[in-house]
Amino acid sequence: AVDLTLLANLRLTDPQRFFLTCVSGEAGAGRGSDAWGPPLLLEKDDRIVRTPPGPPLRLARNGSHQVTLRGFSKPSDLVGVFSCVGGAGARRTRVIYVHNSPGAHLLPDKVTHTVNKGDTAVLSARVHKEKQTDVIWKSNGSYFYTLDWHEAQDGRFLLQLPNVQPPSSGIYSATYLEASPLGSAFFRLIVRGCGAGRWGPGCTKECPGCLHGGVCHDHDGECVCPPGFTGTRCEQACREGRFGQSCQEQCPGISGCRGLTFCLPDPYGCSCGSGWRGSQCQEACAPGHFGADCRLQCQCQNGGTCDRFSGCVCPSGWHGVHCEKSDRIPQILNMASELEFNLETMPRINCAAAGNPFPVRGSIELRKPDGTVLLSTKAIVEPEKTTAEFEVPRLVLADSGFWECRVSTSGGQDSRRFKVNVKVPPVPLAAPRLLTKQSRQLVVSPLVSFSGDGPISTVRLHYRPQDSTMDWSTIVVDPSENVTLMNLRPKTGYSVRVQLSRPGEGGEGAWGPPTLMTTDCPEPLLQPWLEGWHVEGTDRLRVSWSLPLVPGPLVGDGFLLRLWDGTRGQERRENVSSPQARTALLTGLTPGTHYQLDVQLYHCTLLGPASPPAHVLLPPSGPPAPRHLHAQALSDSEIQLTWKHPEALPGPISKYVVEVQVAGGAGDPLWIDVDRPEETSTIIRGLNASTRYLFRMRASIQGLGDWSNTVEESTLGNGLQAEGPVQESRAAEEGLDQ
């Protein structure tokens, strides 16, 4: 079963402190988008138990294998079904937790009921707040059964489900007719696909005999162990406060697993942690009881004492669940509960036993799932134990399952079942992916989907030139990193294949399908240099360059010119597609810009070394704005403008342009040229009387410059309507003399 646990914190004084945590003990669980495993999902399932909408719950990920749900604002947010999904592929598993309101009218005596196919299930709802009305039972949200309130037995409403079948599984609820559904008692019924003690497609296989309340999985025959127990048959107790398939997880908080409900993959369901019981898992086990929900009784013999977490603690000389076995009876020692081998390997399996009389080689045997008995090929006898070694024939997939080591002496017998997992070495389903290529190297992503079993321990890349009969070159790489194949030949096709391995002897899988990857052509090695450049306009630049003279043909397809505008952080690239070209005209540049210029030879997609850079300043597109523009009305149709020349001119002004517009007018402005650039005054004539005008102006060199400030002025008096403004200019001094 998948190592997935959903913990609910049941200290319910304040719903805001309530949280659910999903913990995965799976290798690579929840890593997300990579090929090795989808993420853990934890959510409220509103399909069956609908609760009024509230603020969204907060999901927090703690590393790759843990996710926590918080943000419950009121008690009704907690009521209902929560689920956690984890594991990858066919092992994807959903763990379900059902939360009941402690203040509900009806409360379940037991929330999770796991029963076998054909059994009778009895769900019991205890009356917490009585109502004299019908009780409605539902199954997965749909009406199922009715009881009259008189049908309560000893303060409980019972729903008997005879001869249950797997489709009967689901969420059941008992609700008083007048009450809110949130006041219901919610149950979870899990019906195993087989009768008691059986598993497999036709229920033909025998379960291993799960101990300590473990439940046999009807699909794979594994024991799903209660929280706090481990081993193939759940025979071993974890240390207090620990859980997970290998006891690798620790309960949070100082009070250990108190107040926590643990939900595990079906067919286990949910329970308190080992040593705790009660609806909120806050009560310690009564003396003589132990385990999850305190469901187990110690019944220790021969002076054993009961520990509420682990069961009987035996005195020296005794062992067994109830301390019922004398140490003189033979005993299998330290047998691993689970072993893993790769398909078609021939492993050696050791089985050690002690006892009095001392076990010898012939008294220890190994039994396969199909009933075949293997005898040991050799035995190592030590003072305190005998270790028998078994050479296993070549493994096939059918060898997966429960094997048994058995020791028999005149003092008695002992056997220990253990799980053997036969794993299929991984085989890539796709070819590796080319990421980048150069003339002498290829960068390859070896991460591919695969058939067979993980985890992937090593990835081998095999490569050789296409159509070659030479030996393959091999490189061993990290599964999660890209690989660079070096020292290759330029412009050459290579056949590349992936081989995956999993841990253990014989873990190498078959090679994956090949793919063709071609190296790039050779890099151009010549470095051009810039001979010169000249400005052909505010946005045009002529550039020339040359190449060193070398013997042999020129390795190159053309040139790339790069202009870097550092002010704007922009790069302009110009492709010259002839390798014979030594000059280029660059147009559409930004006037007044400082550029850094260089040139490179290119071949295929590869660039050679860049020339030493040159720095070029293009002239600005136009001069700065005229200064101190001033307007003065002279009559009812004339206004004089005066100004000062722009500062820091890049060249001689060719003309000025004046813009005239009626203030608040909707029409287009009028532009008037002042063709004598040395002047600093002009008269605008033909204006309308008593009219307010707006004026601004700019100078032109090779292009128009910036606008000056805008000035306002009104014409005088009530003259006749003019035909339109015209201009007369002269030197400022002369204008003033007038």
């Epitope: 009024p52 004299q132 009715t146 009259d148 809110s180 949130l182």
Partner: antibody
Framework: EVQLLESGGGLVQPGGSLRLSCAAS????????MMWVRQAPGKGLEWVSG????????LYADSVKGRFTISRDNSKNTLYLQMNSLRAEDTAVYYC????????????????????WGQGTLVTVSS | DIQMTQSPGTLSLSPGERATLSCRAS???????VAWYQQKPGQAPRLLIY???TRATGIPDRFSGSGSGTDFTLTISRLEPEDFAVYFC??????????FGQGTRLEIK
Amino acid sequence: EVQLLESGGGLVQPGGSLRLSCAASGFTFSRYTMMWVRQAPGKGLEWVSGIYPSGGVTLYADSVKGRFTISRDNSKNTLYLQMNSLRAEDTAVYYCARVNYYDSSGYGPIAPGLDYWGQGTLVTVSS
Amino acid sequence: DIQMTQSPGTLSLSPGERATLSCRASRSVIISYVAWYQQKPGQAPRLLIYGASTRATGIPDRFSGSGSGTDFTLTISRLEPEDFAVYFCQLYGRSPRIIFGQGTRLEIK
């Protein structure tokens, strides 16, 4: 398809007895509360009796209490009404009906209703 | 015992008109316990509305129910010829378990 089919009606003298049956099909009969409702000629509907799924709880209208007995055989999917000491005022069409329980809204309480009815059987008590 | 009283006894309207049928409980009741039924001559009643306001499966949306406390209403927004029938309100009670109103006859004007 859910079907309820009443039978056993007929003409009977005052003081006489009659047993009505209601054969159910198309649903899991043993899980539903069932009712008998009657309608005198030209009059309204009157509830007569009800029985819960287990058969352990039965309910009667005051007008028939002590004279009528409701029962069910879940193995035969059949509802019964044993009518003794019949009176002229018991003359009516007798319907059997199934009680269903609905979620009236996503979050509100459950709402009962008589969702399927038989076609009725006429009982005439007359001398 | 609680009683359910329907009004009017008879309602004469034309197709296309709006019908409003009333049902009053003799004391306040839980709304989820109120249902409405339609009965045509020679036929068994048919469940229209449960929980005072939720239409049963297959019931056209011209039928709607409302009300709370003691007063409940069945509204047919636009009468179709097949809607002319007798309508009963019903309460799911304690004792007696099922209480019907005396019915409202809806006839063509």
